[in-house]
């Protein structure tokens, strides 16, 4: 039996078929017989034999166009219809649904918990170093340094609320002015968007899913970076955020109220506090130059303490330091005085795993980092799997229509603003933008939510996290109320300004276009996603930090040429795409540069060379895990294990073999992969990928 001829696209160039005489091709069963079985026998085929069959009359019924990768996949329901089920089947179906819902909620719970533990792990690994960033005196004079410190600290502690609370306490103790704190808050806003980008990396197994998930996550990054790019210079020039927030704070006579409500934490805290509990004050103390804090552990040992005020004899450097002359004496060498000292008595130890191990913070941090990333990854995979099996047919249609459809004309423009409110509300409920955006990421990946809809939800999330901060500020004690409220308001107005810049006019929604561009690149070269993370969240901030420490002349000396080159490249790029005729022939494309400077292909080759040895064991491991997972879930035989290794697809791309239409493949998952489209595996399809 001859294989299906490759006529999805008529080939004008026969020489393309002459490369490599034989290729292994699976036999496609007769199309008329819609069987579920896959004939897996493979026969060597000489492509040369097919040459005479060049015809524009395609043997496939419909012409196959390459789908827009950003179109949402159709989640087909291949199950038995409800009306066709008997009573037993219906009961079974209901129980299955309930079971899936319970599993979904369970994995979602552990997903959120693992995010919390991940934050704790990052604080243990980099918290003290992060605290030391703040003790740099140049922050006051250099807003750029403040910005990168905000980014780095938030990235290191994986929590914008931690870095913001450090800033608040520093402002309250006059170690930092509100003016100097604003760039740090902007940086913290950028830093917090790394979490959902990390979550998106977990979906790297499926190109198309990853394209959407990564773009959906980085839309947050681009919004924050672009907002800072515009608003930081505006703030430095006009101090509008400082002025507006100061007016608001001064116009109200606030009384500190009740504590900000802990909504999601009420559920997650009982579990996360069994894993680890941190003494967050230590990072703040380091930031405030408290030498004693440098030797303190971040791992909380005593949870129940009794603080008693007692008069204690303490030594002082000189008589001038005495409480009063009559309360001063000497032992012949040292001068002593009596001071009111708060004495902390330890009553009960905490009940977490690490309480009795006495391990260094770094060790605990690394352990928790590995565990939380594994749990995060596992939960995410399971959430995506469960959602994939739930969101089919009617359910999918209803959900997708509800989420992605606009209001009827003329109110269509309101839909996005409603999404912003929903995002803000949801973030307020979960009390964390990281949690909300991280939960959103897999939904974008599997195609439940479009990036166009995810964008306003993310913007809303940014607003939601600031309302939480405002509430927390209103609940703070009198001495920090003013500063914490002003900083929370700065954060709020910064996000509002960002939304006004990058949302109302569709043309200005640059973050969507940029995220899609990055999504496309990352889908093709998946290593680039990690490079993006390292460059944008570590390398650039650390470079700016280093240059800032070297002083303004160095920063300007290096920064100005770099900025000039970036502007030049952007202008050239714009002219190349809009009006290339204006440019000389040589500049109409980037071919005048070495390939490695305008293409990722050579870099990909280099990286493949390095990662090659690790791919095979990784692949095997992945397949085994996937098989176990499929058995546990009761998925179809092959599930999506073929996603783990892209040998076939990447091999074909490398050989220049055209990507085939789905019908010409036996393995449906591979066909979808090749097309850059992902669908939930057909429950009836029996794959033989393993």
């Amino acid at each position: 039996m001859a294989p299906w001829p490759e006529l999805g696209d008529a080939q004008p160039n026969p020489s393309k078929y002459l490369e490599g005489a034989t290729s292994q091709q699976p036999i496609t069963p007769d199309k008329s017989k819609e069987t579920n079985k896959t004939d897996n026998t493979e026969v060597p085929v000489t492509k040369f034999e097919l040459l005479p069959t060049y015809s524009t009359a395609t043997l496939i019924e419909e012409p196959t166009e390459v789908d827009d990768p950003w179109n949402l996949p159709t989640l087909q329901d291949s199950g038995i219809k409800w009306s066709e089920r008997d009573a037993k089947g219906k009961i079974l179906c209901v129980f299955q649904g309930i079971g899936r819902l319970i599993l979904l909620l369970g994995f979602l719970y552990f997903f959120v918990c693992s995010l919390d533990v991940l934050s704790s792990a990052f604080q243990l690994v980099g918290g003290k170093m992060a605290g030391q960033f703040f003790s740099n005196s140049s922050i006051m004079s250099n807003p750029l340094l403040g910005l990168v410190i905000g980014v780095l600290v938030t990235v290191f502690v994986q929590s914008s609320s931690t870095s913001t609370s450090i800033v608040v306490s520093m402002v309250a103790s006059s170690l930092l002015t509100v003016r100097a704190a604003i760039p740090i808050i902007m940086g913290a806003n950028i830093g917090t968007s790394i979490t959902n980008t990390i979550v998106a990396l977990m979906q790297v197994g499926d190109r198309s899913e990853f394209r959407r998930a990564f773009a959906g996550a980085t839309v947050h990054d681009f919004f924050n970076w672009l907002s800072v790019l515009v608003l930081l210079p505006v703030e430095v020039a006009t101090h509008y955020l400082e002025v507006v927030t100061q007016l608001i704070v001064e116009s109200f006579h606030f009384k500190n109220g009740e504590d900000a409500p802990d909504l999601l934490k009420v559920i997650t805290k009982p579990f996360t506090k069994l894993i680890v509990q941190l003494d967050k004050k230590v990072i703040s103390q380091i930031a405030m130059n408290d030498e004693t804090a440098k030797n303190k552990s971040l791992v909380k040992i005593w949870c129940k303490t009794f603080t008693n005020m007692t008069q204690m004899n303490v030594t002082v450097p000189s008589m001038a330091n005495c409480t009063s002359p009559s309360l001063c004496w000497t032992d012949g060498i040292q001068i002593w005085t009596m001071k009111n000292v708060t004495y902390k008595e330890n009553i009960a130890k905490c009940q977490h795993i690490f309480v009795n191990f006495h391990l260094p913070d770094l060790a605990v941090g690394i352990i928790l980092l590995i565990i939380s990333l594994l749990v995060l990854c596992g939960c995410l995979i399971m959430i995506v799997k469960i959602l994939g099996s739930v969101l089919k047919g009617q359910v999918a249609t209803v959900i997708k229509k509800t989420i992605n459809t606009d209001f009827p004309f003329p109110f269509a423009w309101l839909t996005g603003y409603l999404a912003i409110l929903v995002g803000a509300g949801m973030t307020f409920i979960v009390q964390s933008s990281s949690v909300f955006t991280s939960a959103l990421t897999p939904l974008i990946g599997i195609g439940v939510i479009t990036i166009e809809r995810a964008y306003p939800l993310t913007l809303g999330s940014n607003i939601g996290t600031t309302t939480t901060a405002i509430l927390a500020a209103l609940a703070s004690p009198g001495n920090t109320l003013r500063s914490s409220l002003q900083i929370a308001l700065c954060h709020f107005f910064f996000n509002i300004s960002g939304i006004l810049l990058w949302y109302p006019i569709p043309f200005t929604r640059l973050p969507i276009r940029m995220a899609k561009g990055l999504g496309n690149i990352s889908a093709k070269y998946r290593w680039f996603a990690i490079f993006y993370l390292i460059i944008f969240f570590f390398l650039i901030p650390l470079t700016v930090f280093g240059l800032s420490l070297a002083g303004w002349p160095v920063l300007v000396g290096v920064g100005v040429p770099v900025v000039f080159i970036i502007i030049l490249v952007l202008c050239l790029r714009l002219l190349q795409s809009r009006c290339p005729r204006v440019l000389p022939k040589k500049l109409q494309n980037w071919n005048f540069l070495p390939l490695c400077m305008h293409s990722l292909k050579p870099w990909d080759a280099v990286i493949s060379k390095f990662t090659g040895p690790f791919q095979m064991p990784c692949c095997c491991c992945c397949r085994v895990c996937c098989r176990v997972c499929c058995l546990l879930c009761g998925c179809p035989k092959c599930c999506r294990c073929s996603k783990c290794c892209q040998d076939l697809e990447e091999g074909q791309e490398a050989q220049g073999v055209p990507v085939k239409a789905p019908e010409t493949f036996d393995n449906i998952t591979i066909s979808r992969e090749a097309q850059g489209e992902v669908r939930a595996p057909d429950s009836k399809t029996e794959c033989t990928a393993l």
Partner: antibody
Framework: QVQLVQSGAEVVKPGASVKMSCKTS????????MHWVRQAPGQGLEWIGA????????SYNQKFKGRVTLTADKSTSTAYMELSSLRSEDTAVYYC?????????????WGQGTLVTVSS | DIQMTQSPSSLSASVGDRVTITCKAS??????VAWYQQKPGKVPKLLIY???TRHTGVPSRFSGSGSGTDFTLTISSLQPEDVATYYC?????????FGGGTKVEIK
């Protein structure tokens, strides 16, 4: 029990130096400040200075500054006082004493005293 | 330096008498005052510190009081073994200084 045993009596010429010792036992030497007090015949008590053996920190009465040196040898739990440029008015009984009442300058254990006679 | 002036320089009292010795500081010393007893040919012995705290093993007939600049040592009922010279000492400032001493005798 706490014991402070001082070296024997000394007769020295004016302008010379004298170094006396105070060997301790019955307590941890580095814990308490060691004070040196003198008493001229038929006169009152006069504080010379103190040393904290744990760190070697010292404190002197300005009256004796430059003439007195207090040292402590942790290995032998012995304190030393050296007084130079002796004059006839330095004739006195020199006591070493410790204060076990931490943070105070009230001394509660005394050595038996070393009589130093400055005579030409 | 802080001067500690003791009065009287000597006193004679009968057994069972109440004896009071006073000590005046040249400046405020708070309560950083100690009292010592020195019997003839013996080393001084600490009686009281912190103005009124009796040292271990000191009989209850010895008591101290005062604050600031004026301090008092009281022997509520003089005993033959109390014959000695009594010194006050301040430890509020360096150098530590002693009073001139009060010689107590039995009539």
């Amino acid at each position: 029990q706490v014991q402070l045993v001082q070296s024997g009596a000394e007769v020295v010429k004016p302008g010379a130096s004298v170094k006396m010792s105070c060997k301790t036992s019955g307590y941890t030497f580095i814990t308490y400040n060691m004070h040196w007090v003198r008493q001229a015949p038929g006169q009152g008590l006069e504080w010379i200075g103190a040393i904290y053996p744990g760190s070697g920190d010292t404190s002197y009465n300005q009256k004796f500054k430059g003439r007195v040196t207090l040292t402590a040898d942790k290995s032998t739990s012995t304190a030393y006082m050296e007084l130079s440029s002796l004059r006839s008015e330095d004739t006195a009984v020199y006591y070493c004493s410790i204060s076990t009442i931490i943070t105070t300058g009230a001394v509660d254990y005394w050595g038996q005293g070393t009589l130093v006679t400055v005579s030409s | 330096d802080i001067q500690m002036t003791q009065s009287p320089s000597s006193l004679s009292a009968s057994v069972g008498d109440r004896v009071t010795i006073t000590c005046k500081a040249s400046q405020d010393v708070g309560t950083a005052v100690a009292w010592y007893q020195q019997k003839p040919g013996k080393v001084p012995k600490l009686l009281i510190y912190w103005t009124s705290t009796r040292h271990t093993g000191v009989p209850s007939r010895f008591s101290g009081s005062g604050s600031g600049t004026d301090f008092t040592l009281t022997i509520s009922s003089l005993q033959p073994e109390d014959v000695a010279t009594y010194y006050c000492q301040q430890y509020s400032r360096i150098p530590l200084t002693f009073g001139g001493g009060t010689k107590v005798e039995i009539k």
